[in-house]
Amino acid sequence: LYFSRDAYWEKLYVDQAAGTPLLYVHALRDAPEEVPSFRLGQHLYGTYRTRLHENNWICIQEDTGLLYLNRSLDHSSWEKLSVRNRGFPLLTVYLKVFLSPTSLREGECQWPGCARVYFSFFNTSFPACSSLKPRELCFPETRPSFRIRENRPPGTFHQFRLLPVQFLCPNISVAYRLLEGEGLPFRCAPDSLEVSTRWALDREQREKYELVAVCTVHAGAREEVVMVPFPVTVYDEDDSAPTFPAGVDTASAVVEFKRKEDTVVATLRVFDADVVPASGELVRRYTSTLLPGDTWAQQTFRVEHWPNETSVQANGSFVRATVHDYRLVLNRNLSISENRTMQLAVLVNDSDFQGPGAGVLLLHFNVSVLPVSLHLPSTYSLSVSRRARRFAQIGKVCVENCQAFSGINVQYKLHSSGANCSTLGVVTSAEDTSGILFVNDTKALRRPKCAELHYMVVATDQQTSRQAQAQLLVTVEGSYVAEEAGCPLSCAVSKRRLECEECGGLGSPTGRCEWRQGDGKGITRNFSTCSPSTKTCPDGHCDVVETQDINICPQDCLRGSIVGGHEPGEPRGIKAGYGTCNCFPEEEKCFCEPEDIQDPLCDELCR
């Protein structure tokens, strides 16, 4: 058994007569043989669920669900209740109604086995019938909404009459009807004014009924019509088996360059017309099992269940449904030497499904794992300026397809042929598995005999120790010019173009910092700033060379505070800034301020 509503509303007046009927509560059956029996909770409750008093005033007919006044609620009773309402004015009280034999503790009141009945209290006697507006004669102030479970026996779930009005104003004639399209499963009995379902409802056909209740009031010669919405929601049960959209039960996948743990290899979709179990329960009750096969496959793959609510069209209206994505995911990084083909089967079980038929599906994944070979071009040729500063990025090396790699740990090393000319270093970028070449020793750059640098680049897969090699030829160009004494270590300190371009800083390939002129459009990614190389800094990403020293590019790498208009980077640096941003790396501080229009020096000279 279950209530067709979780809350009911009615009005209470001082000194209303004992025996006054108040309202009906309705229960619907889950099974044809069920017979409802109602009981009231022992207490009246007030504001913020305050327990006010034992309920000595309102009774219920156990078999019909009729609530009525057992004794009049007089001023002194009301005062007694008000005193206990934690100092709040007592405008509303409520009672709990339980469906027997549901044995719920008085403290808990949750649908479907319990409903609350709210009474709005008026510190006056019942108004004269002639003063009541048609709206007050027809419907409660709070509009009801109804919940009906699908596939359950039909039954009565509402009674239109306002019982106190009917009881105290017998000369006013009130008639009701439901406005509904053809063939809807509801009827309103003209004599009893009870609304019932004609047949069991199917949520998968229609989930919401937006009906309209029409009330016609006859009082003497006048006739008035009042209309209110009458919404009914159909509650779901697990009566649909999972299916394959378009019959697709097999997915094929190739694992090659993306070999990282947590990589999604393939996805199969399952459709279920139901929206139960609810999201909290779903993963526990809607299970997926990778069927035992080869041990390697069991260790290497897992299945992830990603349910999502969707809506589908049924009989001209949209109803909710669930799509379940089953993703075949790598459970570990795969070695580049791994080479196999296999078929995996996944059993999906909608464990709440009661039939007819089975709530079980079998998903098939055909997976090919291909080996990866490491290849480098035979030769790299690069040039570097003699003026380049330490950590200046001068180029990249990359095994074939390295940008597409994930989960493949390639380390690059440089072997120099001339021991005293070992100028460059290389670090592996985690983002694209490339090797970034940078200046590591500026003293070697300045030696006249180091005009040409010869290196062997060796790329090694860390897991298998497989290698690829290439020649690297670096030409050292230009003449050395000593850097300005007293320039800051970091280009980022400078906040004007002039001071920026007269100094070098860590990471500068030319030996001079570069000014990046912003677009001046508020807080922008393209803020003005001084950088060792605008190709790499700032670019919104603290790369593996920049992490070597905070002075290279604090605009991308700073973890400290940023003062002024800005948007912080994720996870660090300045994503966007206002005007010009300059930084003091050793203090973990950056400033983003409006562009200086005038140099203070001008100010002095023009005075």
Epitope: V493, E587, E588
Partner: antibody
Amino acid sequence: EVQLVESGGGLVQPGGSLRLSCSVSGFIFKNYAMRWVRQAPGKGLEWVSGISGSGGITYYADSVRGRVTISRDNSKNTLDLQMTNLRAEDTAVYYCAKAEYSSSGAYFDYWGQGTLVTVSS
Amino acid sequence: DIQMTQSPSSLSASVGDRVTITCRASQSIHNYLNWYLQRPGKAPKLLVYAASSLQSGVPSRFSGRGSGTDFTLTISSLQPEDFATYYCQQSYSAPYSFGQGTKLEIK
């Protein structure tokens, strides 16, 4: 009210060690970089060492590099300067200072009263 | 390293006088310059930062000017408590050097 109080100064022999401390109150310590500045008797001010708010970045004047270590404990609001292998020319009043920043660099807006370190045999 | 040179090294003046102290950097430090006052036996006190910004609580008779390599601190009308030693300091490049000081004495 912002307060910086240095302690730990005294007489030490050449080659000896000393640990200076600076206890601070009146501001959110972890949000500010700190400095040690010294002043030899009758002489000018000399910047000695600095540390960022988090303590993650430290830096030193060439005259003390390798002999001095700056550190901070943000939970206790203290700044320390560990000095080893002391020389006669390290004799000075040592001040701890709070560093504030504008986009034109650091300035020292609050200073302690100083603690005297004398290196002599 | 950047050298900071103050002039004059010492200066005699009277209460009410207008006094200017100069600080020169060995290379351009733009406006990355601060001024401090130090009374005998006391800790230094910040007067001006970023070449011309007056620290809060510092009387308006103090003012700073300059950019690049040449900077001045001006006291428009000397008060008795202003007789002390004044230091400039650059904050452009480590080590953050101070000038040698200018001692302002009562005439």
